[in-house]
Interface confidence: low
């Protein structure tokens, strides 16, 4: 007996071939001997089976002795043995229909679990193997689970169902809802405008929800809500914003915030959360702000940074085109009685400059100039 595997919702074509290459009488029946369809001369006739409106054949092939049974919009319960009667012969084809679905929405938040459920006909014992977009393989029986979805799990999952040495392939598009970056850090000189961007790692037709940026300034004892906003069909509208600092927010995606100027009291870490409509849980992105200030007070030239710096970052003060006068893994460095000239304050990581501020030291009878 020939075995054919089909996919729920798809169309299958079961073949039946006569030895004579001409149109002769044929019938397709199910295992209960109920007629599905056949012919009467050049006309297609249908029986009383439950497939009635979904069954068809290809009349163009009858003259070649081919009498296929086409079943559209396959259902699991269409799994059966189908019998083609032609030229006093009987050809049997066993059709097994499988379905594979994500048990929840196919749009899932980062960190959530994905469960794929296989629908199969009674008596079958299929095995399933799925390959994620990042190449990870998972195997299982009736259900497959992936916990802690990551951004790289977004895309097409390819699942192969194996039964009777035959296989059928399913493709399921999974969208992991997340920000492109889990964390970002912005380095700015005091007084500069700060741009925070929160690009999403997915695109959907309509995006609705609400969000908030909480900020923990390094100098503050507790965190503070800087801004709350609504998102409706990808349009952003601000609900509430603090007076200090007065953030501006872009009205389109990607989410974009502008801080008029970087000041030491703003240096710190923020957490932007986005709650999407009809989803449990929130998207998160951490953002950090490091602010640098170079000052000269009397005979002391000081360079300071505020905000979440790593212990391996180096802070240096150097006269332009000269060796560093002072270089420390600290958040403040200074030089007493600096000589006149253009001094550079540098924050660097393994030799790579992250932030630079220049200050001009004038001869002792003048006041310093900050370019």
């Amino acid at each position: 007996k020939k075995v054919v595997l089909g996919k729920k919702g798809d169309t299958v074509e079961l073949t039946c071939t006569a030895s004579q290459k001409k149109s002769i009488q044929f019938h397709w029946k199910n295992s209960n001997q109920i007629k599905i369809l056949g012919n009467q001369g050049s006309f297609l006739t249908k029986g009383p089976s439950k497939l009635n409106d979904r069954a068809d054949s290809r009349r163009s092939l009858w003259d070649q002795g081919n009498f296929p049974l086409i079943i559209k919009n396959l259902k699991i319960e269409d799994s059966d043995t189908y019998i083609c009667e032609v030229e006093d012969q009987k050809e049997e084809v066993q059709l097994l229909v499988f379905g594979l679905t994500a048990n929840s929405d196919t749009h899932l938040l980062q960190g959530q679990s994905l469960t794929l459920t296989l629908e199969s006909p009674p008596g079958s014992s299929p095995s399933v193997q799925c390959r994620s977009p990042r190449g990870k393989n998972i195997q299982g029986g009736k259900t497959l689970s992936v916990s802690q979805l990551e951004l790289q799990d977004s895309g097409t999952w390819t699942c192969t169902v194996l039964q009777n040495q035959k296989k059928v392939e399913f493709k399921i598009d999974i969208v992991v809802l997340a920000f492109q970056k889990a964390s970002s850090i912005v380095y700015k000189k005091e007084g500069e405008q700060v741009e925070f961007s929160f690009p999403l790692a997915f695109t959907v037709e309509k995006l609705t929800g609400s969000g908030e940026l909480w900020w923990q300034a390094e100098r503050a004892s507790s965190s503070k809500s800087w801004i709350t906003f609504d998102l409706k069909n990808k349009e952003v509208s601000v609900k509430r914003v603090t007076q200090d600092p007065k953030l501006q927010m872009g009205k389109k995606l990607p989410l974009h915030l502008t801080l008029p100027q970087a000041l030491p009291q703003y240096a710190g870490s923020g957490n932007l959360t986005l709650a999407l409509e009809a989803k449990t849980g929130k998207l998160h992105q951490e953002v950090n702000l490091v602010v640098m200030r170079a000052t000269q007070l009397q005979k002391n030239l000081t360079c300071e940074v505020w905000g979440p710096t790593s212990p391996k970052l180096m802070l240096s003060l150097k006269l332009e085109n000269k060796e560093a006068k002072v270089s420390k893994r600290e958040k403040a460095v200074w030089v007493l009685n600096p000589e006149a000239g253009m001094w550079q304050c540098l924050l660097s990581d393994s030799g790579q400059v992250l932030l630079e501020s220049n200050i001009k030291v004038l001869p002792t009878w003048s006041t310093p100039v900050q370019p």
């Epitope: 990808k234 509208s237 601000v238 501006q248 927010m249 872009g250 009205k251 389109k252 974009h256 502008t258």
Partner: antibody, heavy 118, light 108 residues
Framework: EVQLVESGGGLVQPGGSLRLSCAAS????????MHWVRQATGKGLEWVST???????YYPGSVKGRFTISRENAKNSLYLQMNGLRAGDTAVYYC????????????WGQGTTVTVSS | EIVLTQSPGTLSLSPGERATLSCRAS???????LAWYQQKPGQAPRLLIY???SRATGIPDRFSGSGSGTDFTLTISRLEPEDFAVYYC?????????FGPGTKVDIK
Amino acid sequence: EVQLVESGGGLVQPGGSLRLSCAASGFTFSSYDMHWVRQATGKGLEWVSTIGTAGDTYYPGSVKGRFTISRENAKNSLYLQMNGLRAGDTAVYYCARGNYFYYGVDVWGQGTTVTVSS
Amino acid sequence: EIVLTQSPGTLSLSPGERATLSCRASQSVSSSYLAWYQQKPGQAPRLLIYGASSRATGIPDRFSGSGSGTDFTLTISRLEPEDFAVYYCQQYGISPFTFGPGTKVDIK
């Protein structure tokens, strides 16, 4: 330098058609809402049409069904196709840019004059 | 349609004086969506205030905006000679994005 330059204005008979163009430069055109605003001599500003970044379009009742706004991002161009023109459509037509960060029209062209008269 | 009414129609003041312009909406407008523009004869309008109270880039701090709901105000703390012009409010929240009829500030 951010700039908007309108063209295509002129004299047209009632019932006639005209197509206005606006050439944008100095900014990422595709990222911004764009507008047409008109002003009859000695009168106030009247909003005519808006096209969003996704191609979504908005019109007041006075021009709906007669005017069509469109954009060609590859050419940094905004258009206004005006059909069934009436004497009341006579005005200076300004092309304008909606700001990316907030709701407000922050860049305006110098305008092109449309006169509908027999 | 949201109808914006501006008052007074004309405001006659001298340089150095304070100007208070009103914009009233026929229904509530989110303050995020309210803007003020200045227009001088023969010129295109210029954005002054967005979000009801935020000054646009390059606008002097003598211009300030306030208000919420249906009542909004543009204040010019000390009129300079270059401030004599027509001022329009606009709501950019609900289509049609209507303008007010304008208030003309002229020299007394």
